[in-house]
């Protein structure tokens, strides 16, 4: 799945600069590409480490450049390696001196298993020495000096994979520096076969493409693309999708292209020779000019593209009539997609003619895994491939590639996928309060594991041993209603982030139990002061149907001091409680309920004052009104909180002795007026009012005067009495 290309410029080294450039075309591989010496092929070559640099002219390429003064150190075998999914893709090549005694016919030679092979070297220097031939540095053959032919050949009948390797030729007095190299590549399978047992027929690879024995795919020569290598690239371009360009003034002249085995090395289309610096002669095209144009209708033979078909014709020889082929295009694929971890169904949509088939559309993950479509359909002018990734995870983030490879060409579109971790609360929700049929819950989504933002929250709840139900919630505090009393519940929160499948795994579970339905409050509640520091609460005896033990919970609070609160548990068989250790002259509020395991309902609040620790103040706002010849109305107000138990009205006729007064004692402190009766007409009286509590009576500051009216015959003596 990696488009790795090694450009050897030039394999025959003279005194000029020479280089190796390794290009990972299409998209960035996971691991860096490396260039090194191929000691497997040639053990005794130079040991100096290579100075590998980044090729600044390309997005993802490495380069080794030798200056002319380093010429003596260059001879040997080299490789470029890229890794995908831990598997190495290695491309091999060689460099040799242009002044070598022999030169190979080709830099590499690819044959099928079982082929009869002749590896040949051309004698370019005549010497009176034996010629020697080596394979991977090991001696295989010698030719006596007087028998060295112009073409030195190694004959291999029935080629086998173990015959593959680097063959070198030199005179016996020479060395690595004067050796010529050629590499034999032997396909594991017989011609036109591929597969583990070589039983599957290869696609016919056009334009000298080579069928890969492991995949059955065509490795296309530089300048051709597509499933069958039928589609010619634009001149001076190369790579699986023809996206790479030769930057030289004459295009790909002097560039030897090496591709993964079993392709080997060749010139780009339109060029031939060991140095790829000879243009194809008329009527020839393709890599190494090995292809001949046989244009059906005498169309132009282009040395780069072959027959240039006129409108309405197609095929290598323009022999087919019909709609012209259109290189596939990938449509509507965004550059960046954010997805949630879990199931992922990426879609690749492509146009072109013929429309791509399901087998021609693939998706390549960042680790190099190639996915085939799970679902496929044709819509309008497009092929739509739907892929299924059952579990996409954050490590799958990176550059994915939609790849379409048809007879009309190949196109790849990289796009970035960012896989987000689904959010999951770190803590269980908190139960703030519960009743017999409700629970108040704090659904705090923070902190959470995974990626935000949080789009929505679901509160999952269920009675233990039942199915989960959920409610979408927005607020942090939520009241869950309509619960069953005295039931164990489980709660958890599920968070969701934006996008399809954004719901995370529910967080930790919280258990709680709803209360039982409570008993009614005690009946006949009465709250009375007992002393300056105690109040007495009483109620009627309690009878329940429940077998559960019960008790009375009494809550008392001071109305003056809000922090002063006490809850007292009273055994259920008692009917009163003394609330002691209170503050004198303070008002308290008290309520009670009957609790079993469940809490009962609270009673209404009762209020009472503790007895006073000081004398009461004088009644205030004393008024004498409605005076007649024998009656007068006396009114007053008293200040609350002094445990006033009675009011004393004392009156006497002016001028009479002190001991001749009359006292009226009103024992109901809530009475605020009294009618004095039986008074003498036209008489002046002195009236005093006292408040009385547990400590004593108040001290009047002054007496109030009252003078009755003259006698009126109409008024009858009805006797003294109070008027409320």
């Amino acid at each position: 799945a990696m488009d790795l290309i090694l450009i050897n410029s030039l394999p025959l080294v003279s005194d000029a600069e020479t280089s190796l450039t390794c290009i990972a075309s299409g998209w960035h591989p996971h691991e860096p590409i490396t260039i090194g010496r191929d000691f497997e092929a040639l053990m005794n070559q130079h040991q100096d480490p290579l100075e590998v640099t980044q090729d600044v002219t390309r997005e993802w390429a490495k380069k080794v450049v030798w200056k002319r003064e380093k010429a003596s150190k260059i001879n040997g075998a080299y490789f470029c390696e890229g890794r995908v999914r831990g598997q190495a893709i290695r491309i091999r090549t060689m460099k040799m001196r242009q002044q070598a005694s022999f030169l190979p016919a080709t830099l590499t030679m690819t044959v099928d298993r079982g082929d009869n092979v002749n590896i040949s070297f051309k004698k370019v220097l005549i010497k009176e020495e034996d010629a020697v031939i080596y394979k991977n540095g090991s001696f295989i053959h010698s030719v006596p000096r007087h028998e060295v032919p112009d073409i030195l050949e190694v004959h291999l009948p029935h080629a086998q994979p173990q015959d593959a390797g680097v063959y070198s030729a030199r005179y016996i007095g020479g060395n690595l520096f004067t050796s010529a190299f050629t590499r034999l590549i032997v396909r594991r399978c017989e011609a036109q076969k591929w597969g583990p047992d070589c039983s599957r027929p290869c696609t016919t690879c056009k334009n000298n493409g080579v069928c890969h024995e492991d995949t059955g795919e065509c490795i296309c020569p530089p300048g051709f693309m597509g499933r069958t290598c039928e589609k010619a690239c634009e001149p001076h371009t190369f790579g699986r999708t023809c996206k790479e360009r030769c930057s030289g003034p004459e295009g790909c002249k002097s560039y030897v292209f090496c591709l993964p085995d079993p392709y080997g090395c060749s010139c780009a289309t339109g060029w031939r020779g060991l140095q790829c610096n000879e243009a194809c002669p008329s009527g020839y095209y393709g890599p190494d000019c090995k292809l001949r144009c046989h244009c059906t209708n005498e169309e132009i033979c282009d040395r780069f593209q072959g027959c240039l078909c006129s409108q309405g014709w197609q095929g290598l020889q323009c022999e087919k009539e019909g709609r012209p082929r259109m290189t596939p295009q990938i449509e509507d694929l965004p550059d960046h997609i954010e997805v949630n971890s879990g199931k992922f169904n990426p879609i690749c949509k492509a146009s072109g003619w013929p429309l791509p088939t399901s087998e021609e559309m693939t998706l390549v993950k960042p680790d190099g895994t190639v996915l085939q479509p799970n679902d496929f359909n044709y819509t309008d002018r497009f092929s739509v491939a739907i892929f299924t990734v059952n579990r996409v995870l954050p490590p799958d983030s990176g550059v994915w590639v939609c790849s379409v490879n048809t007879v009309a060409g190949m196109v790849e579109k990289p796009f970035n996928i960012s896989v987000k971790v689904l959010p999951e609360p770190l803590h269980a929700p908190n139960v703030i309060d519960t009743g017999h049929n409700f629970a108040i819950i704090n659904i705090s989504s923070e902190p959470y594991f995974g990626d935000g933002p949080i789009k929505s929250k679901k509160l999952f709840y269920k009675p233990v041993n039942q199915a989960w139900k959920y409610i979408e919630v927005t607020n942090e505090i939520f009241t869950l209603n309509y619960l069953e009393p005295r039931t164990d519940y489980e709660l958890c929160v599920q968070l969701a982030r934006p996008g399809e499948g954004g719901e995370g795994h529910p967080g930790p579970v919280r258990r709680f139990t709803t209360a039982s339905i409570g008993l009614p409050p005690p009946r006949g509640l009465s709250l009375l002061p007992k002393s300056q520091t105690a109040l007495n609460l009483t109620w009627q005896p309690i009878f329940t149907n429940s077998e559960d033990e019960f008790y009375v919970e009494v809550e008392r609070r001071s109305l003056q001091t809000t922090s002063d609160q006490q809850n007292i548990k009273v055994p259920g068989n008692l009917t009163s409680v003394l609330l002691s250790n209170l503050v004198p002259r303070e008002q308290y509020t008290v309520r009670a309920r009957v609790n079993t395991k469940a809490q009962g309902e609270w009673s209404e609040e009762l209020r009472a004052w503790t007895l006073s620790d000081i004398l009461p103040p004088q009644p205030e706002n004393i008024k004498i009104s409605n005076i007649t010849d024998s009656t007068a109305m006396v009114s007053w107000t008293i200040v609350d909180g002094y445990s006033i138990s009675s009011i004393i009205i004392r009156y006497k006729v002016q001028g009479k002795n002190e001991d001749q007064h009359i006292d009226v004692k009103i024992k109901n402190a809530t009475v605020t007026q009294y009618q004095l009766k039986g008074l003498e007409p036209e008489t002046t009286y002195h009236v005093d009012i006292f408040a009385e509590n547990n400590i004593g009576s108040s001290n009047p500051a002054f007496s109030h005067e009252l003078r009755t009216l003259p006698h009126s015959p109409a008024s009858a003596d009805l006797g003294g009495g109070k008027m409320l």
Epitope: D130, V132, Y134, K135, G137, S138, F139, I140, H141, S142, P144, L156, P157, H158, A159, Q160, Q162, D163, I172
Partner: antibody
Framework: EVQLVESGGGLVQPGGSLRLSCAAS????????ISWVRQAPGKGLEWVAR????????YYADSVKGRFTISADTSKNTAYLQMNSLRAEDTAVYYC????????????WGQGTLVTVSS | DIQMTQSPSSLSASVGDRVTITCRAS??????VAWYQQKPGKAPKLLIY???FLYSGVPSRFSGSGSGTDFTLTISSLQPEDFATYYC?????????FGQGTKVEIK
């Protein structure tokens, strides 16, 4: 697994003939060279002859040229050494050996068969 | 024919010793030399080919070197199973020729 099995050895009178066979298995017979190497009792190794079964090319040691003939039947994956005009100095253990791809070293050897030339 | 001369013709050594056997060719044979081990009553076994390449399955205590006319077989630490006769062979030209052998015996 590569195997070479010689047969046909025995006692023969001087001037007599003998045909040795070498049955090969476990490799591509026609893609290898097959040699015969002999070892006289208590002596060193001496190369006798070789053949390329693919094209029938043959080579002989000077000591046996004209008397011995090496041949191969690719349909049976078998090489033969026809020995005529045998001499006492031909007495030896005869090994069939494979040269693999090129006529260089011998990477597989048979167990050997003894040829005794005596009156 | 190219003559291959081995020395010594025999040697005595102990287990653990470093043993060196040399072979001289009568003319330049490049690196076209192989070394074999033979035990009594058995066929020879290939140890080294092309002067310095260790044949597969052969222990790494065996090594070969040389080029041109002078070649060496070295056993870095002699083992009990290494007591045998060793032959060099040139394959530079036809006929291939063998050295006369070196017998390695227990001291």
């Amino acid at each position: 697994e590569v195997q070479l099995v010689e047969s046909g050895g025995g006692l023969v009178q001087p001037g007599g003939s003998l045909r040795l066979s070498c049955a090969a298995s476990g490799f591509t017979f026609s893609g290898s060279w097959i040699s015969w190497v002999r070892q006289a009792p208590g002596k060193g190794l001496e190369w006798v002859a070789r053949i390329n079964p693919y094209d029938g090319n043959t080579y002989y040691a000077d000591s046996v040229k004209g008397r011995f003939t090496i041949s191969a039947d690719t349909s049976k994956n078998t090489a033969y050494l026809q020995m005529n005009s045998l001499r006492a100095e031909d007495t030896a253990v005869y090994y069939c050996a494979r040269n693999n791809r090129f006529p260089t070293w011998f990477d597989y050897w048979g167990q050997g068969t003894l040829v005794t030339v005596s009156s | 024919d190219i003559q291959m001369t081995q020395s010594p013709s025999s040697l005595s050594a102990s287990v653990g010793d470093r043993v060196t056997i040399t072979c001289r060719a009568s003319q330049d044979v490049s690196t076209a030399v192989a070394w074999y081990q033979q035990k009594p009553g058995k066929a020879p076994k290939l140890l080294i080919y092309s002067a310095s390449f260790l044949y597969s399955g052969v222990p790494s205590r065996f090594s070969g070197s040389g080029s041109g006319t002078d070649f060496t077989l070295t056993i870095s630490s002699l083992q009990p199973e290494d007591f045998a006769t060793y032959y060099c062979q040139q394959s530079y030209t036809t006929p291939p020729t063998f050295g006369q052998g070196t017998k390695v015996e227990i001291k």
